[in-house]
């Protein structure tokens, strides 16, 4: 499965629209950062078969649409970007979708690949406890954005490695 | 490689007014802050101030707010540090560093090479 | 603004020390303290982040600890070329203020 241009422009049109959502001064917000323990070796493609990978993305874009989709986050940022933002994940969610069924057809999908799923969310079971902890304060979703452009941007070189792999 | 690659020496009058360059390479620019950290001859390390070159954000520490102005130019990978009006106690090494802003990750991990800045008349 | 206080601010030691620098903050600063290591006419490196994270690149020898107001940079068994000034930094909030040094030198 290639995936489309299309989607690595969705990409990079979501890290565009999630750096315009700040609402309020990083610098405020130095002593709030934290550990989410991102799992970077789950963004290694080296190690994968391309459907496992493509189910990593999956998983990634799943829980970032997933945490963006609550209320707490409704009320957090500015509402026609986060539409935005909520509509560009879910076009990447589709293509990824296409293609997870299509290679899982090709390659049976190994257990190694079920604690790849497993660390994703347990990664973002931490943000959102991260989150509970701050009561969701302007702060803890300042730092929560800056994570997950981080994350996204992982997943972004994850999808250029697959596409050379082709 | 990550390189952050500081403008040349300078002597100036004082009075004149001065800006020295940062230029960032081998990593996204704009994922990163760059901060300005003075060392005055034989002293030690100052923070003056940071950027953020995603949008140009920048915080000043008391002692220099006022007194330099920090700005980037994310299209050409660049951050800058200007004077209007030099003064003599303005002569010191400069350097330039990345930092993560909110991200877990190491503080000031790269510096540029320092510029030399000497106001004399 | 948060203060930073080094000691002692010079030492003298020999090849295969063990060398300690410790840094007091005014206030509590979790672990968000960094070290840094410069040489003569050189750039600062960082050495340690969040108080005991070893930078990539940096020799085991190096190693940092403590949390709040009291931190430890040691140095197991010293170099020649660990002969330097090291600075710790506070990490928490602007504006970020940095200890006066301590200078490392031959006896």
């Known amino acids: 499965c290639d995936l489309p241009q299309t989607h690595s422009l969705g990409n990079r049109r979501a890290l565009i629209l999630l750096g315009q959502m700040g609402r309020i001064s990083p610098f405020s917000c130095l002593k709030d950062r934290h550990d989410f323990r991102i799992p970077q070796e789950e963004f290694d493609g080296n190690q994968f078969q391309k459907a496992q990978a493509i189910s990593v993305l999956h998983e990634m874009i799943q829980q970032t649409f997933n945490l963006f989709s609550t209320e707490d986050s409704s009320a957090a940022w500015e509402q026609s970007l986060l539409e935005k933002f909520s509509t560009e994940l879910y076009q990447q969610l589709n293509d990824l979708e296409a293609c997870v069924i299509q290679e899982v057809g090709v390659e049976e999908t190994p257990l190694m690949n079920e604690d790849s799923i497993l660390a994703v969310r347990k990664y973002f079971q931490r943000i959102t406890l991260y989150l509970i902890e701050r009561k969701y304060s302007p702060c803890a979703w300042e730092v929560v954005r800056a994570e997950i452009m981080r994350s996204l941007s992982f997943s972004t070189n994850l999808q250029k490695r697959l596409r050379r792999k082709d | 490689e990550v390189q952050l690659v500081q403008s040349g020496a300078e002597v100036k009058k004082p009075g004149e007014s001065l800006k020295i360059s940062c230029k960032g390479s081998?990593?996204?620019?704009?994922?990163?802050?760059i901060g300005w950290v003075r060392q005055m001859p034989g002293k030690g390390l100052e923070w003056m101030g940071i950027?953020?070159?995603?949008?140009?954000?920048?915080a000043y520490s008391p002692s220099f707010q006022g007194q330099v102005t920090i700005s980037a130019d994310k299209s050409i990978s660049t951050a800058y540090l200007q004077w209007s009006s030099l003064k003599a106690s303005d002569t010191a090494m400069y350097y330039c560093?990345?930092?993560?802003?909110?991200?877990?990750?190491?503080?000031?991990?790269?510096w540029g090479q320092g510029t030399l800045v000497t106001v004399s008349s | 603004d948060i203060q930073m206080t080094q000691s002692p601010s010079s030492l003298s030691a020999s090849v295969g020390d063990r060398v300690t620098i410790t840094c007091r903050a005014s206030?509590?600063?979790?672990?968000?303290l960094n070290w840094y290591q410069q040489k003569p006419g050189k750039a600062p490196k960082l050495l340690i982040y969040?108080?005991?994270s070893l930078q990539s690149g940096v020799p085991s020898r190096f190693s940092g600890s403590g949390s709040g107001t009291d931190f430890t940079l040691t140095i197991s068994s010293l170099q020649p070329e660990d002969f330097a000034t090291y600075y710790c930094?506070?990490?928490?909030?602007?504006?970020?203020?940095f200890g006066q040094g301590t200078k490392v030198e031959i006896k």
């Open positions: 950027i953020d070159p995603s949008d140009s954000d920048t």
């Open positions: 081998g990593y996204s620019f704009t994922s990163y802050w």
């Open positions: 969040f108080a005991s």
């Open positions: 560093a990345r930092h993560p802003g909110l991200n877990w990750a190491p503080d000031f991990d790269y």
């Open positions: 206030q509590s600063i979790g672990d968000f």
């Open positions: 930094q506070q990490a928490l909030d602007f504006p970020l203020t």
